[in-house]
Structure formats: C-alpha cells, structure tokens
C-alpha cells in the first residue's frame, strides 16, 4: 500500500512537470507566432506604430512584453483607472517592458507649454526618436496602478551616457497638482531628483513631493515663477537640480537662467544634455523568458 502511495506521488509529480513543460511550449509557440505577426506590422526604422488590433488591451508595456511582443515601438495601452487608451513608446530592449513617459532627442518639439498640454500630453507619437511628454493625467493613472521603477537614460554630446533609477515613482492626481514621489535611488548619473547630493541644498533643490508647475500654473516654492524662467513644465522647487523638459541647447550654454536640459549631478546647471529617455517598469517585473 505504501509503495502504491509513493508511486501515485511520483506519477502526480510527473504529471505536474509535464503540465509545466506543455505550458512553456504553449507560451513559446504563442511568442513565435506573435513575433512573426509583429514583423508584418512593423513599418521600418522610422515610423514604429504597432497596431495589435483589438485583441486585448494592455495596462502598460510590461504586459505587452510578457505577452510575447518583443519589438520596440508605439503601442496602445489603457491603465486600470484610465478612461481611455493612449499611445506610448514601449522600449523592449534593456530587459524589455519599459513604458517611455518622456523623450528628448533633437529639440524638434517645444516643451515650453502650458498646464493643459502637460496634463494631456504632447509631441511626436509616431517616430522612434520623436520627442514627447506622455501627459500628467496618464502618468497618474499609470503610476497608481502598480509600483513602478523610473529609469532615466541620459546622454551628452561627447558620446557619454549615464542613468539614474528610482524605485516607487508615483505621480499624484489633478487635485494635488500631479505631485512627484520617488523612492530609493541607484545609478551612475547621481541623485539629482531627490537632491541628496548635498544636504545643504536639498531644501531648495529636491524635487521630491514637489507639485508640477507650468508658466500658467505656478506651484513651486519660489517667489518668482520657475516654469516661466526655465521655459518648461516640471516638478520645480526653488527651482531645480534636474529639469529634463528644459530648452534644447547643444551642450554648454549661456542664458539668463539655467533653463537647459539639466541633470546637475552629472554636468551641472550650464550643460544641456543631448538626449533623455524617462521610462517606467514595475518594480517586480519578471520577463516571461522560456
């Protein structure tokens, strides 16, 4: 009887193993079919709008990646609380599943815009390197549906690149003026968002828990208007140690204020970066790798 029970256990374990293997094969087949399908949909290097039809909606790019779509490009997503779907660039490299919330690449877009534009989003949602801001409303819906890591990829005009990463990136809602909240920093560019690089400047340079400001909606801690002076919308304090929506200059610049694309802990206030990508992915993201 004991032998029979042991044999039953062994067979059950074998069945479980076989089930797991079958499941893995199913995922692999699905993935190959989808990759094949996406290759037909891809429109080359420049225009990268990928239409998956109305098969199902995805809440972010990590879901798209884990459903087998491994090609970077613009996809439609609909976060849980969001009333409507919207286009976003999914970066399927760097581990995959990144939802790109902002990009600067060539100065082709005007980032000196008002509250409504920053709220709803603006820019080029067609081309691979197109500049855009996803929209504060969309950032709120995205970052409250899950715990996200924000990764900021920075590059200068001397072909150097650095990154900064923050756990638990959250953006508040319209009523609290899209307040920024960030967690633990890691990376190579230095912690310009939380202003932890010097305790004496943190009170005026940190962006943690700052409300969003634009030239027409001033929520900063400065007597003047940071957004107006720095010609961009951002989570200004008095005013900034990072401003990734600043004016596009070619590297070192001189201006009335430090209004370039600034990441203080890497290149200081008077160097405007060549490119920036702000992208998010769930903290606990595990790629479906077979």
């Amino acid at each position: 009887l004991e032998d029979c029970a042991q044999e039953q256990m062994r067979l059950r374990a074998q069945v479980r193993l076989l089930e797991t293997r079958v499941k893995q094969q199913q995922v692999k087949i699905k993935q190959l079919l989808q990759e094949n399908e996406v290759q037909f949909l891809d429109k080359g290097d420049e225009n990268t709008v990928i239409d998956l039809g109305s098969k199902r909606q995805y809440a972010d790019c990590s879901e798209i990646f884990n459903d087998g779509y491994k090609l970077s490009g613009f996809y439609k997503i609909k976060p849980l609380q969001s009333p409507a779907e919207f286009s976003v660039y999914c970066d399927m490299s760097d581990g995959g599943g990144w939802t790109v919330i902002q990009r600067r690449s060539d100065g082709s877009e005007n980032f000196n815009r008002g509250w409504k534009d920053y709220e709803n989003g603006f820019g080029n949602f067609v081309q691979k390197h197109g500049e855009y801001w996803l929209g504060n409303k969309n950032l709120h819906f995205l970052t409250t549906q899950e715990d996200y890591t924000l990764k900021i990829d920075l590059a200068d005009f001397e072909k150097n690149s650095r990154y900064a990463q923050y756990k638990n990136f959250k953006v508040g809602d319209e009523k609290n003026f899209y307040e920024l909240n960030i967690g633990e920093y890691s990376g190579t560019a230095g912690d310009s968002l939380a202003g932890n690089f010097h305790p004496e400047v943190q009170w005026w340079a940190s962006h943690q828990r700052m409300k969003f400001s634009t030239w027409d909606r001033d929520h900063d801690n400065y007597e003047g208007n940071c957004a107006e002076e720095d010609q961009s919308g951002w989570w200004f304090n008095r005013c900034h140690s990072a401003n990734l929506n600043g004016v596009y200059y070619s590297g070192p610049y001189t201006a009335k204020t430090d209004n370039g694309i600034v990441w203080y802990t890497w290149h200081g206030w008077w160097y405007s970066l060549k490119s920036v990508v702000m992208k998010i992915r769930p903290n606990d993201f595990i790629p479906n790798v077979i």
């Epitope: 199902r56 909606q57 809440a59 409250t144 508040g172 009523k175 609290n176 909240n181 606990d284």
Partner: antibody, heavy 116, light 106 residues
Framework: QVQLQQSGPELVKPGASVKISCKAS????????INWLRQKPGQGLEWIGW????????NYNEKFKGKAILTVDTSSSTAYMQLSSLTSEDTAVYFC?????????WGQGTLVTVSA | DIVLSQSPAILSASPGEKVTMTCRAS?????MYWYQQKPGSSPKPWIY???NLASGVPARFSGSGSGTSYSLTISRVEAEDAATYYC?????????FGGGTKLEIK
C-alpha cells in the same frame, strides 16, 4: 507588510447612519486608491466607489451616490465610509481594498446589520 | 453598466477532474480579474489581467479569454479549491463583478 484593518461590526436602526473605518499600514497611504465594496449575505460583490487619499478625490458608483460618502484622514492613514438613511437592504459586509494591477489587499470586512 | 454573467452558478467536481467556469460580459472588456472567496473570508486575488496567476496560486489554475468571453480552468481539482470564484472587470466605470461560481468538491 501591507494591511487594511477595518472597524468592528455595527448594529444600527433603520434611518440611522454609520461610519466605518479602514486603517492602512505598511505603505504610503497617500499614494494608492482605496476602493470600497459591499457584499450582501449570500450574494456577490458590488463596487461602491474609490477615494484617492493624496487629494481626497472620489469617484462613486451611481447606485451609491447619496448613500455613501468616502473620506480620509491622512494623519492617521485611515479611510472612512459613511452610510446614511440605512434600511434592511443595506445589511451587508463592507470591504475596503487596495487594488493594483498584479495584486490586491483587502480589509477583513465590516458587518453592518440594519435592524429595528 | 457592464453586466458579468458567470456560469454555472454551482459546479460539482471530483478531485483530479478538470473544470472550467465562464464569465460573459454584456459588452467587450479589456481584462478580466478573478477572485477566490471562502466562507467568512475576504476575496483573494486569484488571476489578474485575464491570464496571470496571482502570487501563491497553484499552477493548475489558468485563465483565458478576450472581448466578452472569459474562463477560469482548473486542470486537476483538489479539495482546497472548494470556494466561490468571482470575475471582475476594470474596463469601465462602475467596476462590476459576476455573481460567482461556487465550486463544490464531491
């Protein structure tokens, strides 16, 4: 770890009001929506509404407008739901919940019994 | 409001059997969530975004579907699976639940 601790059972008279609480711990209270739901005895679940503690912004199921009022006290990380003009139809277990894309945390439920 | 209809209302199965319960939506939804509830307890998240198992859910459970038709399948039912399973949609406000499928083990 994330916990939502709800207040104890309530026995109330028809026509009266009741305020039940949901105390959050183990996370930053202001960063996540709190949803409220009800489950009548032996029945399914109904979504009442949500509140975003970061701004106290609310969104109600049309069915519960005028019946439920959602509030928060951020100093104590507590969400409240007030139910008014109670009838026997409101006898149910009421849940608070924090829903995310890949997980959900629920309170243990508060039984509200409406009886003369 | 989107109405979710679950069938069957009661499902009786023997250990080791394969069972499937369905959830039909009155109009198309983006994703389906499933909860397991045992008497006297809060609902537990079971399947999220149609087909992803929540943490700690055994691999014998799976979810599938799209549009208006979704299902939860248990490849080999075990005694601990006895519970009521609810589907829920997040696609449009108000968020709604199905009436539940009660799984009984013979």
């Amino acid at each position: 770890q994330v916990q939502l601790q709800q207040s104890g059972p309530e026995l109330v008279k028809p026509g009266a009001s009741v305020k039940i609480s949901c105390k959050a711990s183990g996370y930053t209270f202001t960063d996540y929506y709190i949803n409220w739901l009800r489950q009548k005895p032996g029945q399914g679940l109904e979504w009442i509404g949500w509140i975003y503690p970061g701004s106290a912004n609310t969104n109600y199921n049309e069915k519960f407008k005028g019946k439920a009022i959602l509030t928060v006290d951020t100093s104590s990380s507590t969400a409240y739901m007030q139910l008014s003009s109670l009838t026997s139809e409101d006898t149910a277990v009421y849940f608070c919940a924090r829903w995310l894309l890949r997980s959900a945390y629920w309170g243990q439920g508060t039984l509200v019994t409406v009886s003369a | 409001d989107i109405v979710l209809s679950q069938s069957p209302a009661i499902l009786s199965a023997s250990p080791g059997e394969k069972v499937t319960m369905t959830c039909r939506a009155s109009s198309s939804v983006s994703y389906m969530y499933w909860y397991q509830q045992k008497p006297g307890s809060s609902p537990k998240p079971w399947i999220y975004a149609t087909s992803n198992l929540a943490s700690g859910v055994p691999a014998r459970f799976s979810g599938s579907g799209s549009g208006t038709s979704y299902s939860l399948t248990i490849s080999r039912v075990e005694a601990e699976d006895a519970a009521t399973y609810y589907c829920q949609q997040w696609s449009s406000n108000p968020y709604t639940f199905g009436g539940g499928t009660k799984l009984e083990i013979k």
